[in-house]
Interface confidence: low
């Protein structure tokens, strides 16, 4: 025998108190799949969270963060304070990048400047707190006619040699 609850569509629940008929989800609740015996409570976007998408009978609300903060985690479960470029967030608040490091975003951490000499290049443009250095041609290439400029190496990804 087929479970009568399997006929209940998303946005409803199978109400055991009413002979397993399909009842609409109550206000501020939802069911995103059919055959549910309960509806889930809608997420409420309060405080530093703001509503990006309202809850409906078939889908949960989605939150993002108020200006000055950005989302962290799956489904924006946390909001973290923005910093300025050239800074990183610590428990003591936003802190300027130390000399030799930079951060070109409002989030994340300060990263070391590219070491141009590792690739046999020279520094074409010095780094700042907000920008990486720009590596230029190797000193030996600095001869008439040599004009190519190499962009900075991309940030290291896992799987490459450790720092």
């Amino acid at each position: 025998l087929q479970d009568p609850c399997s006929n209940c569509p998303a946005g409803t629940f199978c109400d055991n108190n009413r002979n397993q008929i399909c009842s609409p989800c109550p206000p501020n609740s939802f069911s995103s799949a059919g055959g549910q015996r309960t509806c889930d409570i809608c997420r409420q976007c309060k405080g530093v969270f703001r509503t990006r998408k309202e809850c409906s009978s078939t889908s949960n609300a989605e939150c993002d963060c108020t200006p000055g903060f950005h989302c962290l985690g799956a489904g924006c479960s946390m909001c973290e304070q923005d910093c300025k470029q050239g800074q990183e967030l610590t428990k003591k608040g936003c802190k300027d990048c130390c000399f030799g490091t930079f951060n070109d975003q409002k989030r994340g951490i300060c990263r070391p400047w590219t070491n141009c000499s590792l690739d046999g290049k020279s520094v074409l443009v010095n780094g700042t707190k907000e920008r990486d250095v720009v590596c230029g041609p190797s000193p030996a290439d600095l001869s008439p006619g040599a004009s190519s400029v190499t962009p900075p190496a991309p940030a290291r990804e896992p799987g490459h040699s450790p720092q």
């Epitope: 962290l72 946390m78 973290e80 990183e88 428990k91 951490i109 990263r111 940030a155 990804e157």
Partner: nanobody, 119 residues
Framework: EVQLLESGGGLVQPGGSLRLSCAAS????????MSWFRQAPGKGLEWVAV????????DYADSVKGRFTISRDNSKNTLYLQMNSLRAEDTAVYYC????????????WGQGTLVTVSS
């Protein structure tokens, strides 16, 4: 210089447990949120968990929620990942990372520790 050294990986049977550690140095560990990521063979990088600087806030990828626990000991400059009810799909190289970045380029990474779940 920031250094992160993961350990604790190995071969474990499905349903088993492992505890990964990440020893941090070169920065004030207790001032920063920390994260775990993983990379399965032939796959892209996947965020696993994040922990606030004081350990009061955690968040997990849906794929590990209820099975993995991220924690830290600021007095030992060490981050942990307790992995329970391991599945074959948890097989990956696990990396700890300074900062709470979710799949953002340019984080500080360790060298990783391999976790293999197989019978």
């Amino acid at each position: 210089e920031v250094q992160l050294l993961e350990s604790g990986g190995g071969l474990v049977q499905p349903g088993g447990s492992l505890r990964l550690s990440c020893a941090a140095s070169g920065f004030t560990f207790g001032d920063y949120a920390m994260s775990w990521f993983r990379q399965a063979p032939g796959k892209g990088l996947e965020w696993v968990a994040v922990l606030s600087y004081d350990g009061s806030n955690t968040d997990y990828a849906d794929s590990v929620k209820g099975r993995f626990t991220i924690s830290r000991d600021n007095s030992k400059n060490t981050l942990y990942l307790q992995m329970n009810s391991l599945r074959a799909e948890d097989t990956a190289v696990y990396y700890c990372a300074k900062g709470p970045l979710i799949l953002a380029a340019g984080n500080y990474w360790g060298q990783g520790t391999l976790v293999t779940v197989s019978s």
